[in-house]
Interface confidence: low
Amino acid sequence: KNSFTKLSIEPAFTPGPNIELQKDSDCCSCQEKWVGYRCNCYFISSEQKTWNESRHLCASQKSSLLQLQNTDELDFMSSSQQFYWIGLSYSEEHTAWLWENGSALSQYLFPSFETFNTKNCIAYNPNGNALDESCEDKNRYICKQQLI
Amino acid sequence: IPFLEQNNSSPNTRTQKARHCGHCPEEWITYSNSCYYIGKERRTWEESLLACTSKNSSLLSIDNEEEMKFLASILPSSWIGVFRNSSHHPWVTINGLAFKHKIKDSDNAELNCAVLQVNRLKSAQCGSSMIYHCKHKL
């Protein structure tokens, strides 16, 4: 038998002394069913799509396939076993892996990126692993909106 | 009552306030009008309960299947705020309210605290150490 009595806990955060938190706060505004973290919004799909389909679905919501700033950006889901399409593709023109906004992949982000097949797209696991897969394969995907 | 089914398969959803900056502490996440602390450390059920209280929040609760699926997709197995005094007692929330959803392995008299585990709720030994997460509804 457990020694638990009836508990009654309804705590509240204390972000500051007696701060009245407005329900219409405009600081960070995410869409429903998106995750807010460090003032970014993420949509973590449960549906599997090709890389192009994923890119278009994100774009339709004024977001883009995940562009990582660092490998701990998604540390809130670092235990996930899933791989997700991210917004990284190889540019023949620039002979480099580029994010959707045109910036180059940092060599420190994925040390193994030189072994990636340049015809493939990149799937990422939030514990920091990345692998290249045919862009026609279907994976879950993550969209990102930067709010500030 | 069956869990409410909601489709979370595409990002095509209406806009709402996520109340991230002003409403959740740094390093917590927001999802569907709740704040979540994503724990990395392991604790017993009761230690987890107290740890969340010390963070001015409550041990993770699961309100519907959509939430359960979302959390299970990004989190490891973790304690939730549901327990029973013995296998002869009903499952209750940390407020002592009846918990109406199915918990697997409930017939085992040793397992009196509940765990979220890959899209299902399961009973476990309250004294075992598991990851915990905290939640506050906005």
Partner: antibody, heavy 119, light 107 residues
Framework: EVQLVESGGGLVQRGGSLRLSCAAS????????MNWIRQAPGKGLEWVAH????????YYADSVKGRFTISRDNAKNSLSLQMNSLRDEDTAVYYC????????????WGQGTMVTVSS | EIVLTQSPATLSLSPGERATLSCRAS??????LAWYQQKPGQAPRLLIY???NRATGIPARFSGSGSGTDFTLTISSLEPEDFAVYYC?????????FGPGTKVDIK
């Protein structure tokens, strides 16, 4: 015995102010969110304001926003409602009520205190 | 804001009869709906929370059902003390709303 007792009601002029209090006993007041709910004579119930256990989360009905202020003193097991710029339509019995986290409902109510706004 | 509509406005029944009260939400509230009973000169009393869970001390003749937008409170066999006004209530984004009430009176 779990109890909520309101006080401070009375007759007030239109545009005037009044402060209602609610004394809680028989439970851990500091662990519960609290609310004010009102009922105009012969009418239904209207939720007025909500305050979380630590006073960080405060919400108001649109009809009272900017005029009413909810507050609490956990050391004194006390809930308050400061009502300013009172209008005729604020005439009602005002109840304080406890809501338990997770049930989205008011499970403990006080007996109410009557506020009459006169012109 | 979610609007709750209750029907009928008045229900005239005799003791021992079954009472069925309806509450409809203008949009889905999933199962976040409560029912209260109020007698003249008294504060409301919580009967049902989360659409179907009886509050502490509420007799088994009271039951709640429904989810989404349509909810029902059933009193299986009316006792003399059950004649009162019944309100439904929901919470969405920390805005609580009540229905206008159904009065159950003696026929």
């Amino acid at each position: 015995e779990v109890q909520l007792v309101e006080s401070g009601g009375g007759l007030v002029q239109r545009g005037g102010s009044l402060r209602l209090s609610c004394a809680a006993s028989g439970f851990t007041f500091s662990s519960n969110s609290m609310n004010w709910i009102r009922q105009a004579p012969g009418k239904g119930l209207e939720w007025v304001a909500h305050i979380s256990s630590g006073s960080s989360f405060i919400y108001y009905a649109d009809s009272v926003k900017g005029r009413f202020t909810i507050s609490r003193d956990n050391a004194k097991n006390s809930l308050s409602l400061q009502m300013n710029s009172l209008r005729d339509e604020d005439t009602a019995v005002y109840y304080c009520a406890r809501d338990d986290w997770g049930i989205d409902a008011f499970n403990i109510w006080g007996q109410g205190t009557m506020v009459t706004v006169s012109s | 804001e979610i609007v709750l509509t209750q029907s009928p406005a008045t229900l005239s029944l005799s003791p021992g009869e079954r009472a069925t009260l309806s509450c409809r939400a203008s949009q889905s509230v999933s199962s976040s709906l409560a029912w209260y009973q109020q007698k003249p000169g008294q504060a409301p009393r919580l009967l049902i929370y989360d659409a179907s869970n009886r509050a502490t001390g509420i007799p088994a003749r009271f039951s709640g059902s429904g989810s989404g937008t349509d909810f029902t409170l059933t009193i299986s066999s009316l006792e003399p003390e059950d004649f009162a006004v019944y309100y439904c209530q929901q919470r969405s984004n920390w805005i609580f709303t009540f229905g206008p009430g159904t009065k159950v009176d003696i026929k």
